[in-house]
């Protein structure tokens, strides 16, 4: 806490001065009006203050604004946005992404930190849903943004917003979430040709039910070991040596190095031994020729 | 009253280092910003570089930047300039100077006598 | 970077006239100028800072004034003590203390 002191002569501030980097805090405190401060918060981020002076500023700022600051503040905070505590950011009405933006680019290039997500979390709620330009907005400062969230918070994403979407923006989700994607995707995509539609949904394919990846197998697509790999085992077990080649194409080869990695062993335990040997890979662990397979599930259903 | 006394001049070899020191009294040390300001044979004055009273922020003509390094240490009122790499264009008077401001104002309020450094081989 | 010009170089006047010291600024200086006074084989000294403000124990006969790109040290009356080079000089963070060439005020 800055102690209350008068402020010396000559130096009560009219504006917000790059003289001011002198000031020690007690004379930031006392020679620095916080209604000037407020309105000129743009100029505060093109003087080099130090931590200890943006802490007498934040504090300046907190008396005027106890109930939260206004976003023709938050707008402008700059750097000093870093001094705030997810606390502080609670109390903020964040309704532009213009500054929401203002405020990614101070910790752009940084790992997501707690005020942040705090801020986001503020903004979204508030929207009610990811929009398109927010998604986009975010995606662009955090890839793993999309990732982070939950299945029940996806749900809220409105499929025009997955043209946002760039396939680094998915590396780190997991089957629930593109669970939650894939539908979305599928139907954000549906009036594009079969080229251009793969090229689009290739990223989301990991939340593909069976049916899904059946009919990609017929329009020659040529899916990647990479994307195959992050197929749902359960479905991609259903699929038959035939559909497999013809959904991998030129890259069916790869199967042969991936052969001990699910969802490949797991399908390839399901595959008929001389169905395999039709790749001509060398796969090994398919079911003996001359051995029933009983589909048990369906056994089931019928009793 | 307020007294500044430098010492440390000499004379160097181009490429040499020599720091300069300041014995500041009279005065709380630790509450004003310090600066160097040198002063070439019968040129006008130039300012070499300035740091603050808590050394958070130091700044540097781009003259000597990357070759001088200006320090201070509060407990023995004392400031610092280590001078790397000279060349005979840093032969001056180094004045140690005391840093004042007012709002949009900032000058130097006192000054030592200065100390001479001449870079000759 | 800004750069102050001070005119006349030398100005050579008796004792008791009036002396009218120009520094001009190559761009609008935000902040205030400070004056110096340097005698030879002294240090500067500082007369006028923040433009217009006298320094502890300058005389009245001292005076500073301008702003923007224009500044002025006037000397209502020349002492014989006030023959000497007068120094301008502002602080930016673009520019730190900037000084100008300086200008000699000799005994005609």
């Known amino acids: 806490e800055v102690e209350k002191t008068a402020c010396p002569s000559g130096k009560k501030a009219r504006e917000i001065d790059e003289s001011l980097i002198f000031y020690k805090k007690w004379e930031l405190e006392a020679c620095v009006d916080a209604a000037l401060l407020a309105t000129q918060m743009d100029r505060v981020n093109a003087i080099p203050f130090t931590y200890e002076q943006l802490d007498v500023l934040k504090h300046k700022l907190d008396e005027l604004y106890p109930q939260g600051y206004p976003e023709s503040v938050i707008q402008h905070l700059g750097y000093l946005f870093l001094k705030m505590s997810p606390e502080d950011i609670r109390k903020w009405n964040v309704t532009s992404l213009e500054t929401l933006k203002a405020l990614l680019e101070v910790n752009k290039g940084h790992e997501m930190s707690p005020q942040v997500a705090t801020l986001i979390d503020r903004f979204v709620k508030g929207r009610g849903q990811l929009d398109k330009d927010t998604l986009d907005t975010l995606t662009a400062f955090y890839p793993g943004y999309l990732c982070s969230l939950s299945p029940e918070e996806l749900s809220s994403v409105p499929p025009s917003s997955i043209w946002a979407v760039r396939p680094q923006d998915l590396d780190t989700c997991d089957p629930r979430q593109l669970d939650v994607l894939y539908p979305k995707a599928r139907l954000a995509f549906q009036n594009m040709n079969g080229s251009e539609y793969f090229v689009k949904i290739q990223s989301f394919l990991g939340g593909a039910p069976t049916e899904d990846l059946k009919a990609l197998s017929q329009q020659n697509v040529s899916m990647d070991l990479a994307t195959f790999m992050k197929l749902r085992t359960d479905a991609v077990l259903p699929l038959t040596v035939a559909e497999v080649q013809k959904l991998l194409g030129p890259h069916v080869e790869g199967l042969k190095a991936e052969e001990r990695h699910r969802p490949v062993r797991d399908w390839i335990l399901r595959q008929r031994q001389d169905d395999l040997d039709t790749l001509g890979l060398g796969l090994q662990g398919g079911i003996p020729n001359g051995y029933l397979v009983l589909d048990l599930s369906m056994q089931e259903a019928l009793s | 009253q307020v007294q500044l006394v430098e010492s440390g001049g000499g004379l160097v070899q181009p490429g040499g280092s020599l720091r300069l020191s300041c014995a500041a009294s009279?005065?709380?040390?630790?509450?004003?910003?310090m600066s160097w300001v040198r002063q070439a044979p019968g040129k006008g004055l130039e300012w070499v570089s300035a740091?603050?009273?808590?050394?958070?922020?130091?700044f540097y003509a781009d003259s000597v930047k990357g070759r001088f390094t200006i320090s201070r240490d509060n407990s023995k009122n004392t400031l610092y300039l280590q001078m790397n790499s000279l060349r005979a264009e840093d032969t001056a008077v180094y004045y140690c100077?005391?840093?004042?401001?007012?709002?949009?104002?900032?000058?130097?309020?006192?000054w030592g006598q200065g100390t001479l450094v001449t870079v000759s081989s | 970077d800004i750069v102050l010009t001070q005119s006349p170089a030398t100005l050579s006047l008796s004792p008791g006239e009036r002396a009218t010291l120009s520094c001009r600024a190559s761009?609008?200086?935000?902040?205030?100028l400070a004056w110096y006074q340097q005698k030879p084989g002294q240090a500067p000294r500082l007369l006028i800072y923040?433009?217009?403000s006298r320094a502890t124990g300058v005389p009245a006969r001292f005076s500073g004034s301008g702003s923007g790109t224009d500044f002025t040290l006037t000397i209502s009356s020349l002492e014989p003590e006030d023959f000497a080079v007068y120094y301008c000089?502002?602080?930016?963070?673009?520019?730190?203390?900037?000084f100008g060439q300086g200008t000699k005020v000799e005994i005609k």
């Open positions: 100077a005391r840093i004042n401001y007012i709002y949009k104002g900032v000058h130097f309020d006192y």
């Open positions: 009279g005065f709380t040390f630790s509450d004003y910003a």
């Open positions: 740091i603050m009273y808590d050394s958070s922020s130091t």
């Open positions: 761009q609008i200086v935000s902040g205030y």
């Open positions: 923040g433009a217009s």
């Open positions: 000089q502002q602080w930016s963070l673009r520019s730190p203390f900037t």
